[in-house]
């Protein structure tokens, strides 16, 4: 190796100078006794290189990129050899930004996979590797105290969330919870949660039914239906309130809200709807009056109301 | 402290009926399901029923249904248990207990003995 | 219904030693089993909820595992007062079941 480049950071944050040395030894005797040295950044000749030759007899070649505007790119320093540039040595510069503080922080407790999955969002783009992790730990106050640690949960790569298993978390107890961001220019920490998982609970949506006729009910009125919902049985102990939510089949109708319903009802006559029109409609629940999170809708169920029942003006025979 | 006191346990000759209560203190009753469990001499535990909150909603074990009934008054911070049509294999020691949001028991009452016997 | 098997049905063991219980389910209740001790002439009390978390003042020394169909109660180090019989419990959904119980004895 005749030549070697040294550079004061190989990562800068964007825009930053950045200064680059390269050395060429004296022994490389093929070379020109005074040869100039060249410098280029991706593709273009970068002028204002400063050359010496030091005592033991080597050449130096200092150059100060006064603003390094891409994120990625080769420098090299070289020497004509013909016709052609001889590379002697080249380093990859980087330049980006230090991670910005991840934002928007918010877990849920999935009681079917027993895990606490917690996203945030990670900020404007870094054009470096930038790692996340979350951290968290065990509490029996309100955080200000910290508890047994908790293992690092960290995201598949370009994922902003990440589980934490069942057999790391503590129901009815409160767990510190913060993202922290690491690239090569610096650290940062969201503002940390302290939450329950039981406090975060995302139920799953009951099961709308149609309720089923029977004998001695009467039947629903015109522009009513009649249904019912079996509720998701692992969470059948957890208080909550469910809303119902309704619109016509056909046309462009908005979804109606109906509600708060509470889960025990089970049942349900909806009026005021429009007679002989298909509806659909779906539910959704919440822990309820403790904190939790809204379930998704439910899947859609489709019930047609009854005929408006006929006045009497409609018994007149027309000839 | 959540403390469950049940009451009304005694000997009855199969085919009777019989009336347990449990009265329940320290905590906020009406915002908790509960359940009975009983438990035959020598033998396991056994889930009898349970009843939802403001009662709404009340599972039966396959063996009691259609003969017992659970019942809560929520004013009164107490929960029962009516059970007719009584056979000798409802000999047991009857618990009530406070159910958790994830469904277990906790805590529960000392028992009353239930003896079915001519 | 969901089948809750327990075993073994009973074990000796001497005071210090590491005990493991365990519990099959007859199908996947995720993490929805719980673990209950009962001394005789008492009502149970509850050990372990949701599959591992420790009921308040319950030592350390009980801990659970397990998540789907199979589960586990571990011991640490057995103590005089843990001579009991422990049954484990689902609660996924209706109707409730419980294990037949394993009987813990003074080797």
């Known amino acids: 190796e005749c030549g070697h480049i040294s550079v004061s950071a190989p990562i800068v944050h964007l825009g930053d100078p950045i200064t680059a040395s390269c050395i060429i030894k004296q022994n490389c005797s093929h070379l020109d006794p005074e040869p100039q040295i060249l410098w280029r950044l991706g593709a273009e000749l970068q002028p204002g290189g400063r050359q010496q030759r030091l005592s033991d007899g080597t050449q130096e070649s200092i150059i100060t990129l006064p603003h390094l505007n891409h994120t990625q790119a080769f420098l090299s320093c070289a020497l004509n050899w013909g016709n052609s540039l001889q590379i002697l040595d080249q380093v990859e510069l980087r330049a980006g930004y230090p991670p910005a503080i991840p934002h928007n922080l918010s877990c849920l407790m999935n009681l079917t996979t027993s895990s606490l999955i917690c996203q945030w969002e990670p900020g404007p783009e870094t054009h470096l590797p930038t790692s996340f992790t979350l951290k968290s730990f065990k509490s029996r106050g309100n955080c200000q105290t910290q508890g047994d640690s908790i293992l690092d949960c960290v995201p598949k790569d370009g994922q902003s969330h990440c589980s934490i298993p069942r057999k790391h978390l503590l129901l009815y107890q409160n767990m510190g919870i913060w993202v922290q961001a690491e690239n090569a220019l610096g650290t940062s920490m969201s503002p940390q949660l302290c939450l329950d998982p039981m406090d975060v609970v995302k139920l799953e949506p009951p099961m709308l039914r149609t309720m089923d006729p029977s004998p001695e009910a009467a039947p629903p009125q015109a522009g009513c239906l009649q249904l019912s919902w079996e509720p998701w049985q692992p969470g059948l102990h957890i208080n909550q309130k469910c809303e119902l939510r309704h619109k016509p089949q056909r046309g462009e109708a908005s979804w109606a809200l109906v509600g708060p319903l509470p889960l025990e009802a089970l049942q349900y006559e909806l009026c005021g709807l429009l007679p002989a029109t298909a509806y659909t409609l779906q539910i959704r629940c919440i822990r309820w009056p403790l904190p939790g999170h809204w379930s998704d809708w439910s899947p859609s169920l489709e019930l047609r109301t009854t005929e408006r029942a006929p006045t009497h003006h409609h018994h007149h025979h027309h000839h | 402290e959540v403390q469950l006191l049940e009451s009304g346990g005694g000997l009855v000759q199969p085919g009777g009926s019989l009336r347990l209560s449990c009265a329940a203190s320290?905590?906020?009753?009406?915002?908790?399901?509960m359940g009975w469990v009983r438990q035959a001499p020598g033998k396991g535990l056994e889930w009898v029923s349970s009843?939802?909150?403001?009662?709404?909603?009340?599972p039966y074990a396959d063996s009691v249904k259609g003969r017992f009934t659970i019942s809560r008054d929520n004013s009164k911070n107490t929960l029962y248990l009516q059970m007719n049509s009584l056979r000798a294999e409802d000999t047991a020691v009857y618990y009530c207990?406070?159910?958790?949001?994830?469904?277990?028991?906790?805590?529960w009452g000392q028992g009353t003995l239930v003896t079915v016997s001519s | 219904d969901i089948q809750m098997t327990q075993s073994p049905s009973s074990l000796s063991a001497s005071v210090g030693d590491r005990v493991t219980i365990t519990c099959r389910a007859s199908?996947?209740?995720?993490?929805?089993l719980n673990w209950y001790q009962q001394k005789p002439g008492k009502a149970p009390k509850l050990l372990i909820y949701?599959?591992?978390n420790l009921q308040n003042g319950v030592p350390s020394r009980f801990s659970g595992s397990g998540s789907g169909t199979d589960f586990t109660l571990t011991i640490s180090s057995l103590q005089p007062e843990d001579f009991a019989t422990y049954y484990c419990?689902?609660?996924?959904?209706?109707?409730?079941?419980f294990g037949g119980g394993t009987k813990v004895e003074i080797k």
């Open positions: 207990a406070k159910l958790g949001e994830l469904g277990w028991f906790d805590p």
């Open positions: 320290g905590f906020t009753f009406s915002l908790y399901w």
């Open positions: 009843i939802s909150s403001s009662g709404g909603v009340t």
């Open positions: 199908q996947g209740i995720s993490s929805y």
């Open positions: 949701y599959a591992s």
């Open positions: 419990a689902n609660s996924w959904g209706y109707p409730l079941t």
